[in-house]
Interface confidence: low
């Protein structure tokens, strides 16, 4: 099936020594209305100012050519975890995932996911308890009133809990995911397992019989070859943002999720670069409509797993790992131990069938070009709530293939890309260095026009 | 040098109808979203519609269901087609091009001269 | 009843500062859109005089600068000259509208 992401993040808790100060208590129902738009609109904002921060990070220590992981997924473990935080422990949090929302950020989230996606989107939360630890019923209900997240005992055994949690993790993926932990630490007193399962449809799905062999740009001088599914007149909605300069592109799901892909033109780029002006709104311009698009996207499969730990302390975190104030959870001190996150993705050509209208009219007008054959960026966002659910960074989509010196012609300007470009303009420096966007003029790119 | 030229104004009766056009030129018209703006004599600017690059539209709340904005590409040519004309729908009509910026939102950059609707029996 | 707040009148020397205000809500200048100003003559169409809360395109004197703060902003002129009397509006993309909203206006007089 076409479109498939399953995120994991694991938050294991354990001993910590004594000490601390007293505990602030939140009045209760405090937290207990629905969000208003304001609110869901400030979350999704925060939540991508979250995502750029974590991924960035994330990125600058990683090796691997390609990345994926959900922000969302880490959000909830950390709310999950400000359910009983307190004091300073708290603030951290809410600063980190860029949340002024006081004590109801968990119950934000999680009301806010309890709507997503309905039919692509399984939302799954598990807490492991050390046999006999006294964790507090305040937030044993709250944990699964919020998120489900029904209190299991390990027996001590270690064996048998490892068996027990990837067979949950297993199921709760539905297989995407096999064998999430390979060790428990003997001091494990507290485990926050939050699996996310996604399976998405293109709303315009791909022609299988067009899917063909073709070049994928590493860089200037090397390519390898891809699977790379085609459309000749794709409803997408594209724009340009300059400085640095990127083209981004919406393919919508089905339920209401979009996909979407940010190709800078050049080779000379990083995660921590490109993010470092994106925001929710920079993605997300109004009266930037579908127009019918000659598309070029590879498919794919990725995987990767992380311990996050690193990098949720460069994020100002690192309390949780040393002395955070969680008496909220116990009484008796609790430090976080690890912090695992694993997605998979896959996309491949299946959806649902576009109407033989929508074509026909769409094919009246104007037709630009938009290939995914270079190194790429790309964002699944749910568009009623704006929440980014994932962030993805890809260099090269066929590590285990051959890479394949280009041709002399080929290099360096990559003509079937430039094809791709046109009708965007370059070189209009109106607006100093900020990350902007802009229409597409065709007096910029004439020999690119597009055919009226 | 960008352009926007409106026409089509006049009087008109209340329940009339009445349809403006505004010829766009010095830019690739089809890249750009537009927006029709009005201004009532002696008050503030209100914005009426917007056109997106592929056609999508968003309405005022005091126009939806009686106004039609539509975009002719080939012509260059934005246009709004009132129906059930008011007397409060008396106004100077701008045509206004809409502009990215650095935030990623936009701004009305170029406007028109306007042309006047006068609705009055 | 305009959607965004701003003074209807206001009034200076020349050579004198000026500042005219703006106010929003969370579903429009408070939901991070950015403001834009328009001046408009007498008699003549709306101009662009700064857009994205502080930016001038070109051609704008230095003398006009705007700045964004919560759910408000505002247009400072300096310097003030008799060629700035006209009316000033204030607009912002408005989410729960899905659309434009302006100010009412305000009218420079340059005494």
């Known amino acids: 099936n076409q479109e498939q992401v399953s995120p994991l993040t694991l938050l294991k808790l354990g001993n910590q020594e004594p000490g601390g100060q007293t505990a602030l208590k939140s009045p209760p129902g405090v937290c207990s209305r629905d969000p208003t738009p304001e609110q869901t609109h400030r979350l999704a904002r925060a939540m991508m100012a979250f995502t750029a921060d974590l991924f960035s990070l994330v990125a600058q220590t990683s090796t691997c050519p390609n990345l994926i992981l959900s922000p969302l997924s880490v959000a909830l473990a950390l709310s999950h975890l400000a359910l009983g935080a307190q004091n300073h422990t708290l603030q951290r949090l809410q600063q980190v995932l860029h949340a002024g929302s006081g004590p109801c950020l968990p119950h934000l989230l999680s009301r806010l996911c309890q709507d997503l996606g309905p039919g692509a989107f399984r939302l799954a939360a598990r807490m492991y308890l050390q046999k006999g630890f006294p964790i507090k019923e305040d937030f044993l209900e709250q944990s699964e009133q919020l998120f489900g997240a029904k209190p299991v005992s390990l027996t001590g055994k270690q064996e048998d809990d490892l068996a027990n949690i990837n067979q949950w993790v297993k199921e709760a993926t539905e297989g995407k995911i096999q064998e999430f932990l390979s060790g428990l630490p003997e001091d494990t007193v507290l485990l926050l397992l939050n699996a996310i399962h996604f399976q998405g449809f293109w709303r315009n799905k791909f022609d299988p019989s067009l899917t063909q062999r073709d070049s994928f740009h590493l860089d200037e001088q090397f390519t390898v070859p891809v699977e790379m599914m085609q459309a000749r007149t794709y409803p997408l909605r594209w724009f340009l943002l300059e400085q640095p300069e990127i083209q981004v592109a919406h393919f919508p799901f089905k339920n209401n999720m979009s996909f979407v892909v940010l190709v800078p033109t050049h080779f000379e780029w990083n995660v921590s670069q490109v993010l470092a002006n994106l925001s929710w709104d920079t993605l997300h311009p109004p009266l930037v409509w579908e127009r019918p698009t000659k598309v070029r996207l590879p498919k794919l499969y990725l995987k990767h797993q992380m311990d996050l730990v690193a990098t949720l302390s460069q994020l100002g975190l690192q309390e949780l790992f040393q002395a955070p104030d969680l008496r909220g959870i116990s009484e008796q001190s609790l430090v976080v131990s690890g912090v695992q996150h694993q997605s998979t993705l896959e996309l491949s050509e299946v959806g649902v069938e576009a109407a033989a209208a929508t074509s026909i009219a769409m094919s009246r007008m104007s037709l630009s070009s938009f290939s995914v054959n270079r190194p790429f960026l790309f964002f699944i966002f749910e568009d009623t709530t704006g929440l980014p659910l994932f962030v993805g960074s890809v260099r090269n989509p066929n590590p285990s293939a051959p890479r394949e010196l280009k041709e002399q012609q080929d290099s360096p300007g990559n003509k079937d890309f430039l094809q791709s470009l046109k009708g965007f303009p370059r070189g209009d420096k109106l607006f100093g260095p900020d990350l902007k966007l802009v229409p597409p003029m065709e007096e910029d790119y004439p020999q690119f026009g597009s055919p009226k | 040098e960008v352009q926007l030229l409106e026409s089509g104004g006049g009087l008109v009766q209340p329940g009339g109808s009445l349809r403006l056009s505004c010829a766009a030129s010095g830019f690739t018209f089809d890249d750009y979203a537009m927006s029709w703006v009005r201004q009532a004599p002696g008050k503030g600017l209100e914005w009426v519609s917007a056109?997106?690059?592929?056609?999508?539209?968003y309405y005022a709340d005091s126009v939806k269901g009686r106004f039609t904005i539509s975009r002719d590409n080939s012509k260059n040519t934005l246009y709004l087609q009132m129906n059930s004309l008011r007397a409060e729908d008396t106004a100077v009509y701008y045509c206004?091009?809409?502009?990215?910026?650095?935030?990623?939102?936009?701004?009305?950059?170029?406007w028109g001269q306007g042309t006047l609707v006068t609705v009055s029996s | 009843q305009s959607v965004l707040t701003q003074p209807p009148s206001a009034s200076g020397t020349p050579g004198q500062r000026v500042t005219i205000s703006c106010t929003g809500s969370s579903s429009n200048i408070g939901a991070t859109y950015d403001v834009h100003w328009y001046q408009q003559l007498p008699g003549t169409a709306p101009k662009l005089l700064i857009y994205?809360?502080?930016q001038r395109p070109s051609g704008v004197p230095d003398r006009f600068s705007g700045s964004k703060s919560g759910t408000s902003a505002s247009l400072a002129i300096s310097g003030l000259r008799s060629e700035d009397e006209a009316d000033y509006y204030c607009?912002?993309?408005?989410?729960?509208?899905?659309?434009?909203?302006f100010g009412g206006g305000t009218k420079l007089t340059v005494l």
């Open positions: 206004a091009r809409e502009y990215y910026d650095s935030s990623g939102y936009y701004h009305l950059d170029y």
């Open positions: 607009a912002a993309w408005d989410d729960s509208l899905s659309g434009w909203v």
């Open positions: 056109i997106g690059t592929g056609g999508g539209t």
């Open positions: 994205s809360n502080n």
